[in-house]
Amino acid sequence: VPRWRQQWSGPGTTKRFPETVLARCVKYTEIHPEMRHVDCQSVWDAFKGAFISKHPCNITEEDYQPLMKLGTQTVPCNKILLWSRIKDLAHQFTQVQRDMFTLEDTLLGYLADDLTWCGEFNTSKINYQSCPDWRKDCSNNPVSVFWKTVSRRFAEAACDVVHVMLNGSRSKIFDKNSTFGSVEVHNLQPEKVQTLEAWVIHGGREDSRDLCQDPTIKELESIISKRNIQFSCKNIYRPDKFLQCVKNPEDSSCTSEI
């Protein structure tokens, strides 16, 4: 008789999830000599231990602590780039500007990027059929808790000037409910972080509005100022040109505003 299985509203665990996490770990430690000491088998065991045999709506940050410990990594605290709803451009930027780091440029962020996972209470099985959706099912699911945990730690580590890339094409350029708005903003340490600089990325080619005046950006400025952190904002009118100029800063067209 087939065992009854909980049907969740979200997609199931990414296929070949264990193999993918292990492969990414091996690759990351090969590319980054400073992480060469990491034992990828132990990393996978700790990752698995965070959610296997546990109810996927009852995951805590504590569950991920063994993994956090194994994945401890020092990134230059003044070279951190946060992002919200504009991941691809943020990653393209750090691929070119190699001395800056998004969360997904760290080992733990890289391992989990674009993956979904969950288990089932009291069985050692991974659920490849469905996983809880943050809105429709529960917020304390394995994926959401993981990103909340690593995002908090990443923000806590930041210092000096912290940059954040925001999507100017969205109705809420700054969204209080995003990971950036609900976790990272509140975990920047005022005693370490001097300024949060927002880069608002324009979508339309003819869009010359000053999106730094958007009400949601003003809301972000208010939250940040109340935390005794300075705030600054820049419009990136031409993201394609912006990336090109990061690649080739000497280009004559890169002196004008982008």
Partner: antibody, heavy 117, light 113 residues
């Protein structure tokens, strides 16, 4: 099951070039580095380098920096080794390989390249 | 580059005998971060690609018979076959898995009498 399937043997003239392929199955090459290793007849193994198919970043052994070019096509899950200006010294079996945990755990079957006039 | 030196270059033994082969590296393969040695051993049979036997100097790859044992630390490593079988006829290579460029030893050819 992880497999690396390499292209067939090549017989080429000195000065010519050749492009060898390695098609992966059982994993996404974007999640791994794809390595290449050279083995001349009756000789040992030499690491050529790796490519990261995710961003086309490469790393070569100094000896092969100017001799070999590594590329990849993520849409076909295939890595390539391009060898140009071939000489008899390039007559060898070329393997693609993938590291797992530590060491090269997966190897292609090898492609024999023979350079002869 | 780290130079890997294997000895002997060849040896001939009877089935059932114990075999040891040596691998020396020009620099330490010990990772100071985790105190593990980054050395691998491979077996290559005629007409086949190499097969990973041992990684981390002493950890057997899954499916490798327990007659194969790796030992050593720093710059001196040994592969031992406790009781050689006919199917162990092959060339055995050690590899620096510690730093770029990865380098291999010249190999030890094992022949069965």
């Amino acid at each position: 099951e992880v497999q690396l399937q390499q292209s067939g043997a090549e017989f080429v003239r000195p000065g010519a070039s050749v492009k060898l392929s390695c098609t992966a199955s059982g994993f996404n090459i974007k999640d791994s580095l794809m390595h290449w290793v050279k083995q001349r007849p009756e000789q040992g193994l030499e690491w050529i380098g790796w490519i990261d198919p995710e961003d086309d970043k490469t790393k070569y052994a100094p000896k092969f920096q100017d001799e070999a070019t590594l590329t990849a096509d993520t849409s076909s899950n295939t890595a390539y080794l391009h060898l140009s200006s071939l000489t008899s010294e390039d007559t060898a079996i070329y393997y693609c390989a993938r590291r797992f945990l530590r060491g090269f755990a997966y190897w292609g079957q090898g492609t024999l390249v023979t350079v002869s006039a | 580059d780290i130079v890997m030196t294997q000895s002997p270059s060849s040896l001939s033994v009877s089935a059932g005998e114990k075999v040891t082969m040596s691998c020396k590296s020009s620099q330490s393969l010990l990772n100071s971060g985790n105190q593990k040695n980054y050395l691998a051993w491979y077996q290559q049979k005629p007409g086949q690609p190499p097969k990973l036997l041992i990684y981390g100097a002493s950890t057997r790859e899954s499916g490798v018979p327990d007659r194969f044992t790796g030992s050593g630390s720093g710059t001196d490593f040994t592969l031992t076959i406790s009781s050689v079988q006919a199917e162990d006829l092959a060339v055995y290579y050690c590899q620096n898995d510690h730093s770029y460029p990865y380098t291999f030893g010249g190999g030890t050819k094992l022949e069965i009498k």
